[in-house]
């Protein structure tokens, strides 16, 4: 027999989501207008393509990447889309209120949509650690809190450390990872007897997860270059990201084989490790002066990713209750840190080259930014975790974890679909 959504959630979710949507529509009505100064239609199309790449990454890439659970693939893809759609709307408003509001209305441009999509991507990275253990009503809360926290983090970093759009958005990797891990830590952990099979991966969903990884792999250069100011910086970012992800694919597949006693390749390792290079070079992709350096970083990132996938899941499963296949959280946390360290190293080398004695100060600023991102991620993640534990949301019972039938109508009601 199919599991029904608890009656209270059936009442609560549509009311909660539609009320929120109505509130967003009102906010858009009163406080926003479009940028009326678009002179160059060709330029508009080119600018839109970057946003389109980001949307493909978010909706298809991250949507399918998280769909590898045997009994939770539908929910993974659709809930991701739901969160993306809601997150983009709220992020556009929030960014506008934080950065432009004193001048009157919030002007919506393609750039603000680009920023908002990237902010929403943060939620899609974080949610990998909790998908299957929460319902849509809880995910709405998570979207609102995380987008708000990230928006404020970016605003604070921009004002205190004077970083540009690219630099303060590239903290997204570390922020999203630690946010997701701290939310997961707050949720009920043990999988009750008899439900262990649900968090296992299956062949078809694993294939769709690989499809997600491929989309992310193809579009990662767009993500890393989207907020850079000039064509030459974007060109550097695109090239360096491409070299890094290319090498991390080779490393992921060969490293995965190396890590297995029989030399077999793990799907889970590969899903995640193919993206390693893109995350690792994110912060400094426009600064890396030559391809070989980006390739070395891709290699190191791939090895770290495979190593992490081999040794960390046990710890994460015990402490955080994260299933073995949801390795994006700790993967991004390690690789995001690696990326920040690489940026600091490049900064030091640059400053030494200039011989201007600013090393200590620049490093201190960078460490300050990183620390702030981690602290805000942990604090807001814990707050979200506590909120999600409230009875009002009628969270799925642990026996119903990782089960599409809790949320979806399947006409045939096949148990082993």
């Amino acid at each position: 027999m199919s599991s029904k959504y608890p009656r209270s959630v059936r009442r609560c979710l549509p009311l909660w989501a539609l009320t929120l949507e109505a509130a967003l529509i009102l906010l858009f009505y009163f406080f926003t207008h479009y940028d009326a100064s678009l002179e160059d239609q060709k330029g508009l199309v080119a600018s839109y393509q970057v946003g389109q790449d980001l949307t493909v990454m978010a909706a298809i890439g991250l949507g399918f990447l998280t769909s590898s659970f045997r009994r939770h693939s539908w929910s993974s893809v659709a809930f991701n889309l739901f969160m993306l759609a809601l997150g983009v709307q709220w992020a556009i408003l929030l960014d506008g209120f934080l950065s432009q509001f004193p001048s009157g209305k919030v002007v919506i441009t393609l750039f603000s949509i680009r920023l908002a999509t990237m902010s929403a991507l943060s939620v899609l990275i974080s949610v990998d650690a909790v998908l299957g253990k929460v319902n849509l009503a809880q995910l709405v809360v998570m979207v609102l809190v995380e987008v708000t926290a990230l928006g404020n983090l970016r605003m604070v970093i921009s004002n205190i450390f004077n970083t540009d759009y690219h630099m303060n958005m590239m903290h997204i990797y570390v922020f999203a990872a630690y946010f997701g891990l701290s939310v997961a830590w707050c949720l009920p952990k043990p999988l009750p007897e008899g439900t262990e099979d649900k968090d296992q991966t299956a062949t078809i969903p694993s294939l769709s997860a690989m499809l997600g990884a491929l989309f992310l792999w193809m579009f990662w250069p767009s993500f890393n270059s989207a907020l850079l100011r000039s064509p030459i910086e974007r060109k550097n970012a695109v090239f360096n990201t491409y070299y890094a992800v290319a090498v991390s694919v080779v490393t992921a597949i060969s490293g995965s084989s190396l890590a297995h006693p029989q030399g077999k390749i793990s799907k889970t390792y590969v899903h995640s490790a193919v993206l390693a290079g893109g995350v690792a070079v994110g912060t400094s992709c426009h600064l890396i002066p030559s391809p070989w350096l980006a390739m070395v970083l891709g290699l190191v990132a791939g090895l770290i990713s495979v190593g992490g996938a081999k040794y960390l899941p046990g710890c994460c499963n015990r402490v955080l209750g994260i299933p073995h296949s949801s390795i994006m959280g700790y993967n991004f946390s390690l690789l995001g840190l690696l990326g920040e360290i690489i940026y600091i190293v490049l900064l030091v080398l640059d400053t030494v080259g200039a011989g201007n004695g600013m090393i200590g100060f620049q490093v201190l600023l960078s460490i300050g930014e990183l620390s702030l991102a981690i602290v805000i991620a942990l604090m807001s993640g814990l707050l979200t975790g506590l909120l999600l534990n409230l009875k009002i949301w009628k969270a799925p019972h642990e026996a119903k974890y990782f089960d599409d039938q809790v949320f979806w109508k399947f006409p045939h009601l096949a148990v082993g679909f």
Epitope: D35, G43, R229, S230, L287, P289, G353, A354, Q362
Partner: antibody, heavy 126, light 106 residues
């Protein structure tokens, strides 16, 4: 020869509008961010607004935010500044300038204004 | 970041060595440029990134400094150097200029 040529200046009453244009020649505008900078008579330089190479992002000085709009048409190699609700304090020579991004030691990527137009005078007076 | 130039004006003779200073209200690393503006003309970029000479600018101009204190030095003033000099920061996207230093013939 690489150059920028502004036009559209003149006399306007407070509260009225003007639209400045800046045509680039000798280089492709689509490869560069652009700025407007102004200089009130006998005063120093004041940055007004900037726009990214693809027109995707714009920034404004607080003194003009909500009143001025920067835009560009890369197909016409032209930069614009739409000035609404003009005030007496907007009286100045307006220069367009090219945003040259250069990789500099210890500074990552740095902006400098390497090419300037000759300026166009805007007088706001009743 | 606000920039304060000193002196606001100075008198010098051809052949003199002169130094103009620019102080930022907060550290701006080396995100500082220097411009020269002759009367009735548009500004002209002299030095970027605090110390790098722009192509075509004579080597008598040198820039130095990092953090909050910067200097522009002209080793031997030439008649064409009598102009107004501005420093400008590109550390924040709200670019700011110093108030200018007017160089006059003594």
């Amino acid at each position: 020869e690489v150059q920028l040529l502004e036009s559209g200046g003149g006399v306007a009453q407070p509260g009225r509008s003007l639209r400045l244009s800046c045509v680039a020649s000798g280089f492709s505008l689509r490869s560069y961010g652009m700025h407007w900078v102004r200089q009130a008579p006998g005063k120093g330089l004041e940055w007004v607004a900037d726009i990214w190479f693809d027109g995707s992002n714009k920034d404004y000085a607080d003194s003009v935010k909500g009143r001025f709009t920067i835009s560009r048409d890369n197909s016409k190699n032209t930069l614009y500044l739409q000035m609404n609700s003009l005030r007496a304090e907007d009286t100045a020579v307006y220069y367009c300038a090219r945003d040259w991004r250069v990789r500099a030691f210890s500074s990552g990527w740095l902006s400098a204004f390497d090419i300037w137009g000759q300026g166009t005078m805007v007088t706001v007076s009743s | 970041a606000e920039l304060t130039q000193s002196p606001s004006s100075l008198s010098a003779s051809v052949g003199d060595r002169v130094t103009i200073t620019c102080r930022a209200s907060q550290s701006i690393s080396t995100y500082l440029n220097w411009y020269q503006q002759r009367p009735g003309k548009a500004p002209n970029l002299l030095i970027y990134a605090a110390s790098t000479l722009q192509r075509g600018v004579p080597s008598r101009f040198t820039g130095s400094g990092s953090g909050t204190d910067f200097t522009l030095t002209i080793s031997s003033l030439q008649p064409e150097d009598f102009a107004t000099y501005y420093c400008q920061q590109s550390y924040t996207t709200l670019w700011t200029f110093g108030q200018g230093t007017k160089m006059e013939i003594r």
